[in-house]
Interface confidence: medium
């Protein structure tokens, strides 16, 4: 859920802390570990029993501007014969990430932290069966 | 940097790229509300490549606790509920951005940090290496 209204700040404030206006935070967007790379097993998106495709979304007013989204290729899962088994379900694994949103209000610019939901990949699950009374 | 489209009527002093340091509102906006599927917490158990969640805590980071997925088995669960070692459970990893207090202990000064997390597991056909 959304982090709500600004209230009482209670930290023991070291003298070296930068001054910050009330209700806001100073954010350095030079990312720590910027060059770290994901070392996932090779092309798991194609080898998975719940395979997926990737699409890249681009928004110049967002930092980072590029966010990659996965989409499950099938409703069912791929069996040992390479056929879709609809008795099982391919489901998206979703995760939030933080981004910085740049907003233009007239000629002034403001920045907002935002949580964005990203689909990371898919997994194969046994379906939940609802029995009708 | 990232180029930003700008209102052509505004003074030209503004940088087109994101500045290195910005002041942001303490409220974190949630774009997901009512538009996306809600968190589904039981896939970890129902998956053919099930996983457990393990805790990693750092009080100078937001979020302070990160739960990492660890695949329960090397193989995948077959239709009989047994582990099939002809298939592999592998983690799905993703980079997320977190907030790191910088300088440490300062209440409202942060830096973005990229962290690699395992979010869940998926079942894949193994890569078979044939020895010559």
């Amino acid at each position: 859920r959304k982090i709500p209204k600004v209230g009482h700040t209670f930290f023991q404030k070291p003298e070296s802390c930068p001054p910050v206006p009330g209700g806001s935070m100073k954010l350095d967007i030079g990312i720590i570990n910027e060059n770290q790379r994901v070392s996932m097993s090779r092309n798991i998106e194609s080898r998975s029993t719940s395979p997926w495709n990737y699409t890249v979304t681009w928004d110049p007013n967002r930092y980072p501007s590029e966010v990659v989204q996965a989409q499950c290729r099938n409703l069912g899962c791929i069996n040992a014969q390479g056929k879709e088994d609809i008795s099982m379900n391919s489901v998206p694994i979703q995760q939030e990430t933080l981004v910085v949103r740049r907003k233009h209000q007239g000629c002034s610019v403001s920045f907002q932290l935002e949580k964005v939901l990203v689909t990371v990949g898919c997994t194969c699950v046994t379906p939940v069966i609802h029995h009708v009374q | 940097g990232i180029t930003i489209p700008r209102n052509p009527g505004c003074p030209n002093s503004e940088d087109k790229n994101f500045p290195r340091t910005v002041m942001v509102n303490l409220n974190i906006h949630n774009r997901n509300t009512n538009t996306n599927p809600k968190r589904s917490s039981d896939y970890y158990n129902r998956s053919t490549s099930p996983w457990n969640l393990h805790r990693n805590e750092d009080p100078e980071r937001y979020p302070s606790v990160i739960w990492e997925a660890k695949c329960r088995h090397l193989g995948c669960i077959n239709a009989d509920g047994n582990v099939d070692y002809h298939m592999n459970s592998v983690p799905i990893q993703q980079e997320i951005l977190v907030l790191r207090r910088e300088p440490p202990h300062c209440p409202n000064s942060f830096r973005l940090e990229k962290i690699l997390v395992s979010v869940g597991c998926t079942c894949v056909t193994p890569i078979v290496h044939h020895v010559a």
């Epitope: 859920r1 982090i3 709500p4 209204k5 600004v6 209230g7 009482h8 700040t9 209670f10 930290f11 935070m25 694994i93 979703q94 995760q95 939030e96 933080l98 949580k115 990371v120 | 303490l26 974190i28 599927p37 809600k38 968190r39 589904s40 917490s41 039981d42 970890y44 158990n45 969640l53 805590e57 009080p59 100078e60 937001y62 979020p63 302070s64 606790v65 990160i66 739960w67 997320i96 977190v98 209440p107 409202n108 997390v117 979010v119 869940g120």
Partner: antibody
């Protein structure tokens, strides 16, 4: 294991204020928030508001807005809840509860109450 | 605000019996639903988080299921020490809200 220890019982007159403390030990105080939940005699649980320690921000249930103030002091790892303008309807047991600040199962915030104080009985009577 | 309605309000059960308590939300809350146990003159205790996640130290006879608007807490093989009031709690939307409670006693 996080432990939350609350201040003792209070007897107040209508119109007065009460301030209850909740001292946390074990775990990092910054790694979670504290919510306040009350329970009137023979009734269910009612959330009043909470503080998210990491950003030092608060939010309150509409019903208590303007009457409740939640604060925290990191140096003593203690959270406080002050309720003003007391009436007999505020007679209840008041609990503090820990709210984890987690990235859990792919999401940034979790909001279960995984540890509770022992409760503070507040009696409002003229 | 989101209203949680539990049923039944009261249940009298024989030891070793299976107990099922349901909680219905007035709108979709995904799996942001938690269950607590409260014994007389004690604080509530977390039993299940996020609809189905078990909590370490809680006996395995307690389990949870459901998503969206309909949730269930199941006690498989009730024991005498399980006599308590059980509450569901949603954290999807502020304000946090609780069900009215289900009192379980032993026959």
């Amino acid at each position: 294991e996080v432990q939350l220890v609350q201040s003792g019982a209070e007897v107040k007159k209508p119109g007065e204020s009460v301030k209850i403390s909740c001292k946390a030990s074990g775990g990092s105080f910054r790694s979670y928030g504290i919510s306040w939940v009350r329970q009137a005699p023979g009734q269910g649980l009612e959330w009043m508001g909470g503080i998210t320690h990491f950003f030092g921000i608060t939010d309150y249930a509409q019903k208590f807005q303007g009457r409740v103030t939640i604060t925290a002091d990191e140096s003593t790892t203690t959270a406080y809840m002050e309720l003003s303008g007391l009436t007999s309807d505020d007679t209840a047991v008041y609990y503090c509860a820990r709210e984890p600040n987690d990235f859990w199962n792919g999401y940034y915030d979790t909001h279960d109450f995984d540890s509770w104080g022992q409760g503070t009985t507040v009696t409002v009577s003229s | 605000e989101i209203v949680l309605t539990q049923s039944p309000d009261f249940q009298s059960v024989t030891p070793k019996e299976k107990v099922t308590i349901t909680c219905r939300a007035s709108q979709n809350i995904g799996s942001e639903l938690h269950w607590y146990q409260q014994k007389p003159d004690q604080s509530p205790k977390l039993l299940i988080k996020y609809a189905s996640h078990s909590i370490s130290g809680v006996p395995s006879r307690f389990s949870g299921s459901g998503s969206g608007t309909d949730f269930t807490l199941t006690i498989n093989g009730l024991e005498a020490e399980d006599a308590a009031t059980y509450y569901c709690h949603q954290s999807d939307t502020l304000p946090h809200t609780f069900g009215q409670g289900t009192k379980v006693d032993i026959k």
